[in-house]
């Protein structure tokens, strides 16, 4: 660092003064020198180090007509917004000839009301749930003591006697405000006021009460909501497609869920118009006047299989002698599950009904008993799933086969005796 020499008399006729103030202060330091001949550039030092980017001005006023006469030089250093890093000892420095001259020092100090480095933030918390708030302040002057306030009421008898940087709150049952006061020798600064909003706790024990192919009934246990009664709960249901891939506790579903509101109590809801034999994920959250609780984890549920809602379509039955050829198509109505096969029933006017399980085939050749002279023979077909049989088709009369009619080759199925079924 440059050092001044006392070999010659110092050219400084005015030295920097002192500034002490609060953060953000705008201040100016000045030094004045009188020199003979060409005025030098004035540099500023802080704690002995040249300030390369000093916000300084320089005025030079000649005291005579000749350039070799004396000049008054004034340099001013601006501190635009005082910070802790600006504090220190300030001097002016000039190079005259082969010598350095430094002024007497001036001092800049930061001293004021406490300054907050961290203030409590607004947040939401579940009722009766512990949480922490933070507050941090500094001087100078130190020490800085903190006093926490809840709803404008101090939480300690005096600053510094209660919790300091971190305030642990064991739980709240009503929305409250928190602030902290920072005290030092200069006075008191109050932080921003944080509003802590008390929301209902997350509902618990979301479970299935009953299942129908297109309906699920679910129930849950509400969490505590402080002094604020629950106004309603909201249930969301999502189809559990593989592509969706809902993770347990994932905050937001990737596509728009079905959302239903349930008035409370009871903490139960019937979800209708669902797809049978379909996996879903459901979750629930409850609302008070203060807002919505956090959602439960997504619960995987599944609607059970149902029976097919309609009979097979386009049934045709033709007879050729002692053989009957029957074929049909899958029901157009929803199957409500996995199709396991078809049941076929045929009956003559005065003969008992014969029931057969055809499996998944959609055609069959029947070997009729006797010479095929049974009159008014009719056929019915029903589809079935694991949940049972769907509705039977209307009886289809067996038509005599006419030459030229298409007649596929069918595997012969011997009629086997079966218990009689009445028509649906």
């Amino acid at each position: 660092a440059p050092r001044g020499t006392q070999a010659e008399e110092s050219p400084f006729v005015g030295n920097p003064g002192n500034i002490t103030g609060a953060r953000g202060l705008t201040g100016t330091l000045r030094c004045q020198l009188q020199v003979q001949g060409e005025p030098p550039e004035v540099h500023w030092l802080r704690d002995g180090q040249i300030l390369e980017l000093a916000d300084s001005t320089q005025t030079q006023v000649p005291l005579g007509e000749d350039e070799q006469d004396d000049w008054i030089v004034v340099s001013q250093l601006r501190i635009a917004s005082l910070q802790l890093s600006d504090a220190g000892q300030y001097q002016c420095l000039v190079f005259l000839g082969h010598q350095n001259f430094v002024s007497q020092p001036g001092y800049v100090g930061l001293e004021g009301l406490p300054y907050f480095l961290e203030e409590p933030e607004d947040r939401t918390v579940a009722a009766n749930t512990p949480f922490n708030l933070s507050c941090q302040a500094q001087g100078p002057p130190e020490p800085v003591d903190l006093l926490w306030l809840q709803d404008a009421v101090p939480l300690a008898t005096a600053p510094g006697h209660g919790p300091q940087r971190n305030l642990h709150v064991p739980g709240l049952n009503k929305t409250s405000s928190f602030s902290c006061e920072a005290h030092n020798a200069k006075g008191v600064t109050t932080s921003r006021t944080a509003t802590i909003t008390v929301l209902p706790q997350q509902p618990r024990n979301l479970h299935l009460v009953s299942r129908q192919p297109t309906e699920l009934e679910v129930a849950w246990t509400p969490g505590l909501s402080g002094i604020y009664p629950l106004t309603h709960c909201t249930l969301q249901a999502m189809l559990s497609d593989n592509e969706v891939g809902i993770q347990a506790g994932e905050p937001d579903p990737p596509e728009e869920p079905l959302t239903l509101q349930a008035s409370v109590p009871p903490h139960q809801l019937r979800l209708g118009s669902l797809h049978p034999h379909t996996p879903y994920h459901i979750r629930v959250a409850c609302t008070s006047s203060q807002g919505l609780s956090s959602w439960t984890h997504w619960l995987p549920v599944e609607t059970p299989e149902g029976v097919p809602l309609g009979p097979p379509e386009n049934i045709s039955a033709t007879r050729n002698g002692s053989q009957a050829f029957v074929h049909w198509q899958e029901p157009r109505a929803p199957l409500q599950g996995t199709l396991l096969g078809y049941r076929l029933a045929y009956q003559g006017q005065d003969t008992p009904e014969v029931l057969m399980d055809i499996g998944l085939r959609q055609e069959v050749t029947l070997e009729l008993q006797g010479d095929g002279s049974v009159s008014n023979l009719t056929v019915c077909v029903a589809a079935y799933t694991a949940a049972g049989d769907g509705p039977w088709s209307l009886p289809v009369p067996l038509e005599a086969w006419r030459p030229g009619q298409a007649q596929p080759v069918h595997q012969l199925v011997k009629e086997t005796s079966a218990p009689a079924f009445s028509w649906p």
Epitope: G17, T26, G27, T28, R30, S56, T57, T59, G106
Partner: antibody
């Protein structure tokens, strides 16, 4: 005699630009900070910014930051206010003013002792 | 930013009256307050700097006082040329801010 004379004001469309000049005489621009202050019609005074002509450092009010630029040419003893992206609310008389320099070793704050006559934007 | 609140916003007075204008800062500004006089169509003129120092050439009937947050400009005996608008200004922090002005009118 110390004097500041502004020029360059006029009518401009919103979104337009204008450059104001502040010519100083009777003192050296290098020795002081030069401020720009504006006054909307029938309203009070609002600080726009300052420049240290000796170093070229400038500070701005938040309302003009990024749109206005203050500069100075010490050889011409003139300061400038370049105004871009002008808005209706920038309509005002613009003054340049010299910061008063006391002769003590230090001071907190400042005042403006010489003002130009103002130019209407 | 520091707010400067001037009162009254206007006043009527007669020549020879003692007039007091006050200015309150929203936080401590030490003595970094200046007072200006402005007449219609003219630039402001510096009257007082550093709260209480009379600027060169300003008549001694003008005086300033105060420190911290409360400041006063006093005109001990109002003269015809004193009818104008007066502004206080803090420069303790950047940006400097002005009061909204006090208009002194002839009663």
């Amino acid at each position: 005699e110390v004097q500041l004379v502004e020029s360059g004001g006029g009518l401009v469309q919103p979104g337009g630009s204008l450059r104001l000049s502040c010519a100083a005489s009777g003192f050296s621009l290098s020795g002081s900070w030069i401020h720009w202050v504006r006054q909307a019609p029938g309203k009070g005074l609002e600080w726009v910014g300052w420049i240290n002509p000796y170093r070229g450092y400038a500070y701005y009010a938040d309302s003009v930051k990024g749109r206005f630029t203050i500069s100075a040419d010490t050889s011409k003893n003139t300061a400038y206010l370049q105004m871009n992206s002008l808005r209706a609310e920038d309509t005002a008389v613009y003054y340049c003013a010299r910061e008063y320099s006391g002769w003590g070793g230090s001071s907190v704050g400042y005042a403006m002792d010489y003002w130009g006559q103002g130019t209407l934007v | 930013d520091i707010q400067m609140t001037q009162s009254p916003s206007s006043l009527s007075a007669s020549v020879g009256d003692r007039v007091t204008i006050t200015c309150r800062a929203s936080q401590d500004v030490s003595t970094a307050v200046a007072w200006y006089q402005q007449k219609p169509g003219k630039a402001p003129k510096l009257l007082i700097y550093s709260a209480s120092f009379l600027y060169s050439g300003v008549p001694s009937r003008f005086s300033g006082s105060g420190s911290g947050t409360d400041f006063t400009l006093t005109i001990s005996s109002l003269q015809p040329e004193d009818f104008a608008t007066y502004y206080c200004q803090q420069s303790y922090t950047t940006p400097p801010t002005f009061g909204q002005g006090t208009k002194v009118e002839i009663k």
